[in-house]
């Protein structure tokens, strides 16, 4: 009789452990759901606030007409700068006009002062032609002022209100550019 009672007690205890385990799993599952819900709500809020503000440029980017610009706070070589911009869904700055050049140099003066900033301009090793990264040629007024004496690949950068050239492997700040979002109003 005593053996029977102890067997039942052990079975009950086993059941209790299983229930506790199930409860723990359920609590964990509930916590996971709550966390997912939080992310989902955050995403929804972000989307809604973006829709309300319809901000054409991301935070910390500067807008001018149809473009958004990001001025880096780190130095890197030209190729790494390009990679950094691509990760943001942008490319190194491509200056299309004198007006855009003036805006950029004016903004840089306000933000940082007279530093070097890589732009998306590089010199073809064979022909010596300057080309933007999309393969187009810069307008005559937007060619680097001095030819770099480097035997290595040569890339373009902005300093003060000039476009200059340097060995692509030197370290500089950089400027990314992407299209501004059009407001759908």
């Amino acid at each position: 009789k005593l053996l029977q009672v102890s067997t039942i007690a052990m079975q009950q205890q086993e059941k209790l452990i299983q229930q506790e385990r199930a409860l723990l799993n359920f609590t964990e599952w509930k916590r996971s759901c709550a966390l997912q819900m939080k992310y989902c709500q955050a995403f929804m809020q972000n989307s809604l606030s973006s829709a309300h503000n319809s901000s054409p440029c991301p935070n910390n980017w500067i807008q001018n007409r149809e473009s958004c610009y990001y001025v880096s706070e780190i130095w890197s070589i030209w190729h790494t700068s390009q990679e950094n911009c691509l990760k943001e869904g942008s490319t190194l700055l491509q200056i299309e006009s004198k007006e855009e050049m003036d805006f950029i140099t004016g903004s840089l003066r306000k933000i940082k002062g007279s530093y070097d900033y890589w732009v998306g301009l590089s010199q073809d090793g064979h022909s010596g032609r300057w080309l933007w990264q999309d393969g187009s040629s810069p307008s005559p007024g937007l060619l680097p002022a001095e030819r770099s004496q480097s035997a290595n690949q040569v890339c373009g950068y902005v300093k003060s209100n000039s476009l200059l050239s340097s060995n692509c492997s030197t370290w500089k700040y950089f400027i990314c550019e992407k299209y501004a979002l059009r407001s759908s109003v």
Partner: nanobody
Amino acid sequence: QVQLQESGGGLVQPGGSLRLSCAASGRFFRVNAMGWYRQAPGKQRELVAAITNGGQIVYADSVKGRFTISRDSAKNTVYLQMNSLKSEDTAVYYCNAKAAASYVSTVADYWGQGTQVTVSS
């Protein structure tokens, strides 16, 4: 996780053409840019061409005027049309996506397995 499937590599004569395709699949929140990189034996992997989600395009100096990158956003596919191929273009070509897997994750590089392009007579 983002999966990238390349196709279109092969053996071609100098001056010939090839078209590479890369389809992105899997679960991801957004893709900021897709592109092609290549690695020749004994050399570092280098960017060939890339296209951002906004449609901006980047080419390596060595391929400007010969290669054209394009995309089909609806299919999450990127293409590389390679014309006037040279022996220097011989390499393994890798598809790349700069993507965020979720709303809270940072943008990371995802890579395909690579497809061999050999330019030889």
